[in-house]
């Protein structure tokens, strides 16, 4: 018959991260005589978690809360719990003697970390894609227990299925962390568009933690260009305009060329923005053709966000205008916008 | 009800030896730690000995160890105490006590007086 | 050894009022938070009864006038009201495992 018996009744306990986890253990008998100690794990390499008698436990406090006849509380808390407090704690009743020998354990409590994940990071690519391009996101989260989680991407409030999603590691393990990787088609209208990764998991209680990026660090809308003829304004000038619409980032240069050569280079200022996010900006060349015997050919050359140049050419007939020598081939223009100028 | 019954209390020389019984009865015997303590108008109450239930643990004080001997008898319900070389000191009244715990002494027999005198 | 000195040794109360008396430790009795202290009824030709284990629990079929508190060191077993029947010598007892398990000299409560 069992002499004495060491009760630990929860086989399993859950604590979120930060809070005490009580352990609790009951002992029908002091005999024989001798110390009950605390373990976490089993086997030679078993952690003293507590100890009455000697040692200095700062997190653990006894927690005496039975009044029955029939057994003595043994139970401990746990303060400040990490995840690296998890794993299985034993109550063990020893033998009082030199040494002290074991001489009997609880069946073993089984403590679980409850830990939040981190705010997930989403990432996108390290250099701008153009529309109909795929580009990929990664999302991180690191440090959540367990290890049950649920990640799920969205484009606009739109869910994504295209993603691939690991949680590391595979084993037991304190904590974990998860890795995603999503693949989205840009379109034209994504400057305003976000990427948004959703985790789930059972510490936040149904409130999920959401990390974005905006597409717009990440796409590049080039610009399409037209260059356009005005009425001529003055007797011997001609306005050509270069409207360069939906280009997404700002950062632009144009630089006009007569027959080939450089007449004026200047940097988008004053742009307007489209209700999608993209730019239209618009620069005009005043060209006095009595300085040309012969048909000009007037280039708008664009270079956007550091791509190769894009240019749009137009040739201006001079045939039907009387020439006049020694005028300069370009006018000085006086502004760079989107007025017509008649 | 619980009933614990000490005999073989009596009169003995200094040196000489005694066998103290408890017959138990009212509870199940075989689950409880059973002690004797003794008293004395001179010292009070003083533990003297301790059995654990199944009886393969028994301590004592040190004013009793090597000259004690404690045992039981589960399936007679009985507890012995085995005095050798006793001492004008022990004379006392010798109470049987059960205890659930091993913890506190939850009943005590009414007590046989052993008198050590020459 | 443990040594428990109990206070007063004898102690006189009127019927009706309180009766409080002391046990103290030489050293600490406590286990995981329970204190290994318990109190003993021994009324003239009787064997003494449990009235009190683990410093604060009450033994079946004691009348609730009787009460104990304490930790550590400090103990008090406290009477109240004080009734006829209870005229008696009252002790302490601490059974933590550090052996020998001693018992304090005892109260006598009279009635004043």
């Known amino acids: 018959e069992e002499e004495l018996q060491v009760i630990q009744p929860d086989k399993s306990v859950s604590v979120a991260a930060g809070e005490s986890a009580i352990l609790h253990c009951t002992v029908t008998s002091l005999i024989p005589v001798g110390p009950i100690q605390w373990f976490r794990g089993a086997g030679p390499a078993r952690e003293l978690i507590y100890n009455q008698k000697e040692g200095h436990f700062p997190r653990v406090t006894t927690v005496s809360e039975s009044t029955k006849r029939e057994n003595m509380d043994f139970s401990i808390s746990i303060s400040n719990i990490t995840p690296a407090d998890a794993g299985t704690y034993y109550c063990v009743k020893f033998r009082k003697g030199s040494p002290d020998t074991e001489f009997k354990s609880g069946a073993g409590t089984e403590l679980s970390v409850r830990a939040k994940p981190s705010a997930p990071v989403v990432s996108g690519p390290a250099a701008r894609a153009t529309p109909q391009h795929t580009v990929s996101f990664t999302c991180e989260s690191h440090g959540f227990s367990p290890r049950d989680i649920t990640l799920k991407w969205f484009k606009n409030g739109n869910e994504l299925s295209d993603f691939q999603t690991n949680v590391d590691p595979v084993g037991e393990s304190v904590s974990y962390s998860i890795h995603s990787t999503a693949k989205v088609v840009l379109t034209r209208e994504d400057v305003h568009s976000q990427v948004i990764c959703e985790v789930a998991h059972v510490t936040l209680q149904g409130d999920p933690l959401r990390g974005t990026a905006n597409l717009s660090e990440t796409i590049r809308v080039p610009p399409t260009l037209e260059v356009t003829q005005q009425p001529v304004r003055a007797e011997n000038q001609v306005n050509v305009t270069c409207q360069v619409r939906k280009f997404y980032p700002q950062r632009l240069q144009l630089t006009w060329l007569e027959n080939g050569n450089v007449s004026r280079t200047e940097t988008a200022s004053t742009v307007t923005e489209n209700k999608d996010g993209t730019y239209n900006w618009m620069s005009w060349l005043l060209v006095n053709v009595s300085a040309h015997r012969d048909d000009v050919k007037l280039t708008c050359q664009v270079e956007h966000d550091g791509q190769p140049a894009v240019s749009k050419s137009h040739d201006l007939k001079v045939s039907a205008h009387p020439k006049e020598q020694g005028s300069n081939t370009a006018a000085e223009n006086t502004g760079s916008n989107e007025r017509n100028i008649y | 009800e619980v009933q614990l019954v000490e005999s073989g209390g009596g009169l003995v020389k200094p040196g000489g030896s005694l066998r103290l019984s408890c017959a138990a009865s009212?509870?199940?015997?075989?689950?409880?730690?059973m002690s004797w303590v003794r008293q004395t108008p001179g010292k009070g109450l003083e533990w003297v000995a301790t059995?654990?239930?199944?009886?393969?643990?028994?301590y004592y004080p040190s004013s009793v160890k090597g000259r004690f001997t404690l045992s039981r008898d589960n399936a007679k319900n009985s507890l012995y105490l085995q005095m050798n070389s006793l001492r004008a000191e022990d004379t006392a009244v010798y109470y049987c006590?059960?205890?659930?715990?091993?913890?506190?002494?939850?009943?005590w027999g009414q007590g046989t007086t052993v008198t050590v005198s020459s | 050894d443990i040594v428990l000195t109990q206070s007063p040794a004898s102690l006189a109360v009127s019927l009706g009022e309180r009766a409080t008396i002391s046990c103290r430790a030489s050293?600490?009795?406590?286990?995981?938070?329970?204190?290994?202290m318990h109190w003993y009824q021994q009324k003239p030709g009787q064997p003494p009864k449990l009235l009190i284990y683990?410093?604060?629990n009450l033994e079946s079929g004691v009348p609730d006038r009787f009460s104990g508190s304490g930790s550590r060191t400090d103990f008090t077993l406290t009477i109240n009201p004080l009734q006829a029947e209870d005229v008696a010598t009252y002790y302490c007892?601490?059974?933590?495992?550090?052996?020998?398990?001693?018992f304090g000299g005892g109260t006598k409560v009279e009635i004043k």
């Open positions: 006590a059960s205890s659930l715990t091993g913890s506190s002494f939850d009943y």
């Open positions: 009212g509870f199940t015997f075989s689950s409880y730690v």
């Open positions: 059995i654990s239930s199944g009886g393969t643990y028994t």
């Open positions: 050293e600490s009795v406590d286990l995981y938070g329970t204190s290994f």
């Open positions: 683990r410093a604060s």
């Open positions: 007892h601490q059974s933590s495992d550090e052996l020998p398990w001693t």
